[in-house]
């Protein structure tokens, strides 16, 4: 008698489960070679493909660059070869692995291709305030395709100290509810830190003039 | 800020060679590709060759690739271009350049190369 | 090798014109085209890279576009200082290749 394969206790057959996949957020850089990590288990072997902002893709296919594939895997590395490379990958990439029990699919994971950190010359002109008033200091950081972060130092490389009245909003500006004196300083500077790169790039320094108004002198 | 700043340039004779240098600072060096692009006097652009600071990998424009030779040496954060078997033609100003993804987004201040024959 | 051609080698113009320069493919470069500002005995800057995007720090009166073999920059209104030689450059297949230039001047 011949027991059909999915009977036999050592070959039930199993659906596509993913066991391994890249992070949702993939950044590389021009020199990065690209890698994508697609593993799943299931019986019998799974197939697996691959789309790009929901187009076949096929790495190998690709023209131009040396594609390593692993066996038995969804995972693949694209090696870049010039300097031009790393932006055409850019896109949403979703792995699907199948077998004849159904499909299991990846994550969606955003590939982004970061350029060279860039802020822009500026002749930075002197803020200029009264004693009470609110003020916002602008930090405007470069943009960046992973997440930075974001800190305000004078030029002796201090922090500035932060409290209920100087706080740094989400956009990295740094947001004075009311200005005194004390805060009159020509050295606020905002630093981006990006740590995929361990960069710091840092912004020019703004000049911050505290004008004492008379009714501040008065209720001196 | 990203600076690159050239040195190695001058005067050599038909069939000698010459090292061009080009250090880099302000941005970390092995995320981002080097180039070489060169004019000559009262001519275009044109690109000689281009390096992987992370991996070495090279490519060249094919009309040098027997004379010029890109590298780099990560320690120093410095590009070069040994240039061998010179001619009169490749008198031109030498840029280094650092490729952003898309373009060549910073450039050095350029380096006169003037071969005598 | 992909020949970058454009077709005109100075162009005068005024300050506050509108200035548009063209750039020709030899075939098709999928946008990736860039354009460089060169002033004498300078080295030349990126002012727009991928047709359209504007290189950090330079002014908005820049401006590319185009797709295919066909790309133009435009400059809406000239400022003294935006007299210079422009390049355009493709960088979608080895070897990149830039166009000849073309000079703007000073009517």
């Known amino acids: 008698i011949q027991i059909p394969e999915e009977y036999e206790g050592h070959h039930v057959m199993e659906p596509p489960v993913i066991t391994e996949q890249s992070p949702r957020r993939l950044v590389v850089f021009p020199t990065d070679d690209i890698s994508l990590k697609c593993e799943a288990s299931g019986k019998p072997e799974v197939q697996f493909r691959w789309t790009r902002d929901g187009v076949h893709f096929k790495p190998k296919e690709e023209l131009g660059v040396t594609v390593y594939q692993s066996p038995h895997s969804g995972s693949f590395t694209i090696t870049g070869n010039n300097s031009n490379f790393a932006q055409r990958f850019q896109g949403i990439y979703r792995c699907f692995a199948s077998n004849k029990l159904g499909t299991a699919m990846s994550h969606e994971i955003r590939l982004m291709a970061e350029g060279a950190p860039k802020w822009p010359k500026e002749t930075v002109k002197p803020v200029e305030v009264e004693e009470g008033e609110s003020v916002v200091l602008p930090c405007n950081p470069p943009p960046s395709a992973e997440p930075l972060r974001i800190y305000w130092m004078n030029s002796k490389i201090l922090h500035i100290k932060q409290d209920e009245r100087v706080t740094m909003g989400q956009n990295g500006n740094l947001y004075f509810a009311n200005v005194l004196t004390s805060d009159n300083h020509s050295d606020y500077i905002c630093h981006a830190h990006f740590p995929g790169t361990r960069t710091i790039i840092q912004k020019e320094p703004i000049d911050l003039r505290v004008k004492a108004t008379n009714s501040m002198i008065d209720r001196k | 800020e990203v600076q690159l700043v050239q040195s190695g340039g001058g005067l050599v004779q038909s069939g000698g060679s010459l090292r061009l240098s080009c250090r880099a600072s302000?941005?970390?060096?092995?995320?981002?590709?080097m180039l070489w692009v060169r004019q000559r006097p009262g001519k275009g652009l044109e690109w000689v060759a281009e390096?992987?600071?992370?991996?070495?990998?090279?490519n060249y424009n094919e009309k040098f690739k027997t004379r010029f030779t890109i590298s780099v040496d990560r320690s120093k954060n410095t590009l070069y271009l040994q240039m061998d078997s010179l001619r009169a033609e490749d008198t031109a100003v030498y840029f280094c350049?650092?490729?952003?993804?898309?373009?060549?987004?910073?450039w050095g201040q350029g380096t006169l190369v003037t071969v005598s024959s | 090798d992909i020949q970058m051609t454009q077709s005109f080698s100075s162009l005068s113009a005024s300050v506050g014109d509108r200035v548009t320069i063209t750039c020709r493919a030899s075939q098709d470069i999928s946008n990736y085209l860039n354009w460089y500002q060169q002033k004498p005995g300078k080295a030349p800057k990126l002012l727009i890279y991928?047709?359209?995007r504007l290189h950090s720090g330079v002014p908005s009166r820049f401006s590319g576009s185009g797709s295919g073999t066909d790309y133009t920059l435009t400059i809406s209104s000239l400022q003294p200082e935006d007299f210079a030689t422009y390049f355009c450059q493709q960088g979608n297949t080895l070897p990149w290749t830039f166009g000849g230039g073309t000079k703007l001047e000073i009517k």
């Open positions: 350049a650092l490729g952003g993804g898309y373009a060549m987004d910073y």
């Open positions: 390096i992987n600071p992370r991996n070495d990998r090279t």
């Open positions: 991928y047709t359209s």
């Open positions: 302000g941005y970390t060096f092995t995320r981002y590709w």
